[in-house]
Amino acid sequence: FPMFKRGRCLCIGPGVKAVKVADIEKASIMYPSNNCDKIEVIITLKENKGQRCLNPKSKQARLIIKKVERKNF
């Protein structure tokens, strides 16, 4: 990260509760590690609108985590 040094986690604060499904290009899940002791759900928005962290406790995040885990395992 050229400007901000990485802290323990990638997200700042609790994250958004929900993102419009139509705006989601990609969802990435970062599981707890030595760098960050909590799960983080990072949404890449369509149309070059950047990224947002989804609150991992939100209903939408739980659904995304479940979906990704089902796909991977």
């Epitope: 997200c11 609790p14 949404i43 928005l45 950047g50 990224q51 947002r52 962290c53």
Partner: nanobody, 129 residues
């Protein structure tokens, strides 16, 4: 209605100090990260410093580390940016913003999003040499 009101900008000589304040209202302080951003003429808006109200984490741009300090008074819902050892290159309009879901790595090329971010009107900081 959400409001963020900045104050404390002005003209200062290089090496001097300023303290910016951002008074917020209309939202739950702990649900948001509060950040200071700046925009110099002809340049993109860039992240300067961010405070996560929920856990007290702070983040600083390399260019201001060791010179700027972000803090808050939660009782007053106000965030401060203490700026010391100011340089001419710190000259810019400084904006306070409240946002949800900010990703640290994207703060250099920050894209505001109406649904998740609230912005103040900005305060001019001019550092003369």
């Amino acid at each position: 209605e959400v409001q963020l009101v900045e104050s404390g900008g002005g003209l200062v000589q290089a090496g001097g100090s300023l303290r910016l304040s951002c008074a917020t209202s209309g939202f739950t302080f702990d649900d948001y990260a509060i950040g200071w951003f700046r925009q110099a003429p002809g340049k993109e808006r860039e992240g300067v410093s961010i405070l996560s109200s929920s856990d007290g984490s702070t983040y600083y741009a390399d260019s201001v580390k060791g010179r700027f300090t972000i803090s808050s008074d939660n009782a007053k819902n106000t965030v401060y940016l203490q700026m010391n050892s100011l340089k001419p290159e710190d000259t810019a309009v400084y904006y306070c913003a409240a946002g949800q879901g900010w990703v640290i790595a994207t703060m250099t090329s920050f894209r505001a999003h109406r649904e998740y971010d609230y912005w103040g009107q900005g305060t001019q900081v001019t550092v003369s040499s």
